[in-house]
Interface confidence: low
């Protein structure tokens, strides 16, 4: 239905609060180094010009497209070049091709200063001192860091953090209070962000048909008891709401997700058993629980896939007659009978189905020629499952550290050329696969674990996309997005690989590693591992454990000393000399 | 550029036995799990067998478990398909695929001949 002013239309739907958090966060999302008080300026004459276009929609451009308002707003930046180079060259494009250029711009690892988290009481002092401005430097300082943060679920994560300030800063121990809401909001808000990342990169690469079959399939697994007809009505509503707000559209995302969260409730019955809860919560409530809501119980009587989609003499029909819609069903109606299975995998048996018809439809005997079409699962659903039991046994032997450790050494092997940064952040997630899912039972080890992988492998896909320096995973971040994982699993040691130049500078360490967090003295000791492996990749698994026991001795002896400094660059050196003898550097 | 030459194939007695080799190129063979596919006369494809890329795991299509054995040599580039107990029916033109089983092969393929 079309709006007069698309602005106006907008802000009654979702009000001036939501409207202006909305805006800043597109913004801050676009402009990634403007500073705050920037962004501040142009969402009020937005949020100011809206409301002009409420009162009369035929004042003057009140008509125009949201890209075309907010893309005028921000070139309006007065230092758009010096700060941002050639992204100052989409100011000269018309849209649609000016929002798809700033979009190309956005920087998954925007060159900021890392969140200092200052005293509970200062925190505390300027949430009452300006409640209003202290929550929006919030959605600022996660947009610009998150450029594709899911800007409905972001106001979410707002309120639970405006909530954790309103209750804690009156509590007797503020501190005991506010941190550990503070650390829970800032891992579940790194996790979310990922998640949202992997969407925007199925669309963004893979285009709407991928994104569409992982949506088929994880509401299947959810929703089991819902027709094909209604699944594929809510997989529609989520594309269109995932696909504008990956495209910057925030305002029409965070309105259509109401939508579809309205849709839902309204239709709970036909849909699952397990929304009742959901749907009783206010609207960011509600819709969060809904994306996170337990698989409903598989109804008792479904029938064995093979009559319709092997034994069935029209399957070649049905296959030709609407190729997506019966692939779909086929989706559906394994993934509902399988919430054992991850939905990658789901989707690799819907590819190998897909591509049996495609040849077997074209031969002699079709029926013979794809009567056996389900042995060729096997061997697809056991590797994930060989892979999982192997390395959830490992991570109980080594615990979370070591795993990691483990996984740092087995991925620099694999694609040496990766920035130390960025293999250390890729392996120290990969490696919370263990605590997050190994806990599980069988049933839901393999969802749980990888799904998890995928997200966590597409980060090191569009980190490595922005200075691409391995032909490995670019094949592997490119060919397949349901065989990331298998291709990642499936790369041993570069062999091609020249190992870096030793350089001490790299391994001295300073008094300054006694004051970190424990989790700040693991990354250093990690990305010390991982330069050791980029200077030696021929170095066993024992060698590498003999340096690093040393290594954290060392630490722990110089922490402990009267003088940290001298102890630090005395056996610093020492440990040096003897880590280049035990590994022949 | 990507290159996957399969020979050993020819034309045998039923009961015999053949050993296909596929020499692979322009890629890390090292990196990959490798397939074995086979198309009979006016049929489609069908996958016959699956290695890792270390050579630790092997799956079998039902139809020639038992009788069939894949292999590799990492430091060759080399894939083989050791085929002992030949019947009939597993007259076709083989080829080599990288990647699992849902692989789709690029080569020639090399014909195998089951006939007494």
């Known amino acids: 239905d079309a709006h007069k002013s698309e602005v106006a239309h907008r802000f009654k739907d979702l009000g001036e609060e939501n409207f202006k958090a909305l805006v800043l966060i597109a913004f801050a999302q676009y402009l990634q180094q403007c500073p705050f008080e920037d962004h501040v300026k142009l969402v009020n004459e937005v949020t100011e010009f809206a409301k002009t276009c409420v009162a009369d929609e035929s004042a003057e451009n009140c008509d125009k497209s949201l890209h075309t308002l907010f893309g005028d707003k921000l070139c309006t930046v007065a230092t758009l070049r010096e700060t941002y180079g050639e992204m100052a060259d989409c100011c000269a494009k018309q849209e649609p091709e000016r929002n798809e250029c700033f979009l190309q711009h956005k920087d998954d690892n925007p060159n900021l200063p890392r969140l200092v988290r200052p005293e509970v009481d200062v925190m505390c002092t300027a949430f009452h001192d300006n409640e209003e401005t202290f929550l929006k430097k919030y959605l600022y300082e996660i947009a610009r860091r998150h450029p594709y943060f899911y800007a409905p679920e972001l106001l979410f994560f707002a309120k639970r953090y405006k909530a954790a300030f309103t209750e804690c800063c009156q509590a007797a121990d503020k501190a005991a209070c506010l941190l550990p809401k503070l650390d829970e909001l800032r891992d579940e808000g790194k996790a979310s962000s990922a998640k949202q990342r992997l969407k925007c990169a199925s669309l963004q690469k893979f285009g709407e048909r991928a994104f569409k079959a992982w949506a088929v399939a994880r509401l299947s697994q959810r929703f089991p008891k819902a027709e094909f007809a209604e699944v594929s009505k809510l997989v529609t509503d989520l594309t269109k709401v995932h696909t504008e707000c990956c495209h910057g559209d925030l305002l029409e995302c965070a309105d259509d997700r109401a939508d579809l969260a309205k849709y839902i409730c309204e239709n709970q019955d036909s849909i699952s058993s397990k929304l009742k809860e959901c749907c009783e919560k206010p609207l960011l409530e509600k819709s969060h629980c809904i994306a996170e809501v337990e698989n409903d119980e598989m109804p008792a009587d479904l029938p064995s896939l093979a009559a319709d989609f092997v034994e069935s003499k029209d399957v070649c029909k049905n296959y030709a007659e609407a190729k997506d819609v019966f692939l779909g069903m086929f989706l559906y109606e394994y993934a509902r009978r399988h919430p054992d299975y991850s939905v990658v995998l789901l989707l690799r048996l819907a590819k190998t189905y897909e591509t049996t018809l495609e040849k077997c439809c074209a031969a002699a005997d079709p029926h013979e020629c794809y009567a056996k079409v389900f042995d060729e699962f096997k061997p697809l659903v056991e590797e994930p499952q060989n892979l999982i039991k192997q390395n959830c046994e490992l991570f109980e032997q080594l615990g979370e550290y070591k795993f990691q450790n483990a996984l740092l050494v087995r991925y620099t092997k694999k694609v040496p050329q990766v920035s130390t940064p960025t293999l250390v952040e890729v392996s120290r997630n990969l490696g919370k696969v263990g605590s997050k899912c190994c806990k599980h039972p069988e049933a839901k080890r393999m969802p749980c674990a990888e799904d998890y992988l995928s997200v966590v492998l597409n980060q090191l896909c569009v980190l490595h996309e922005k200075t691409p320096v391995s032909d490995r995973v670019t094949k592997c971040c490119t060919e397949s997005l349901v065989n990331r994982r298998p291709c990642f699993s499936a790369l041993e040691v570069d062999e091609t690989y020249v190992p870096k130049e030793f350089n001490a500078e790299t391994f001295t360490f300073h008094a300054d590693i006694c004051t970190l967090s424990e989790k700040e003295r693991q990354i250093k000791k990690q990305t010390a591992l991982v330069e050791l492996v980029k200077h030696k990749p021929k170095a066993t698994k024992e060698q590498l454990k003999a340096v690093m026991d040393d290594f954290a001795a060392f630490v722990e002896k110089c922490c402990k000393a009267d003088d940290k400094e001298t102890c630090f660059a005395e056996e610093g050196k020492k440990l040096v000399a003897a880590s280049q003898a035990a590994l022949g550097l | 550029q990507v290159q996957l030459v399969e020979s050993g194939g020819g034309v045998v007695q039923p009961g015999g036995s053949l050993r296909l080799s596929c020499a692979a190129s322009?890629?890390?063979?090292?990196?990959?799990?490798m397939s074995w596919v086979r198309q009979a006369p006016g049929k489609g494809f069908e996958w016959v067998s699956s290695?890792?890329?270390?050579?630790?795991?092997?799956y079998y299509a039902d139809s020639v478990k038992g009788r069939f054995t894949i292999s590799r040599d990492n430091s060759k580039n080399t894939l083989y398909l050791q085929m002992n107990s030949l019947r009939a029916e597993d007259t076709a033109v083989y080829y080599c695929?990288?990647?699992?089983?849902?692989?789709?092969?690029s080569g020639q393929g090399t014909q195998v001949t089951v006939s007494s």
């Open positions: 322009g890629f890390a063979f090292r990196g990959f799990g």
């Open positions: 290695i890792n890329n270390g050579g630790s795991d092997t």
């Open positions: 695929a990288i990647g699992g089983p849902g692989a789709s092969p």
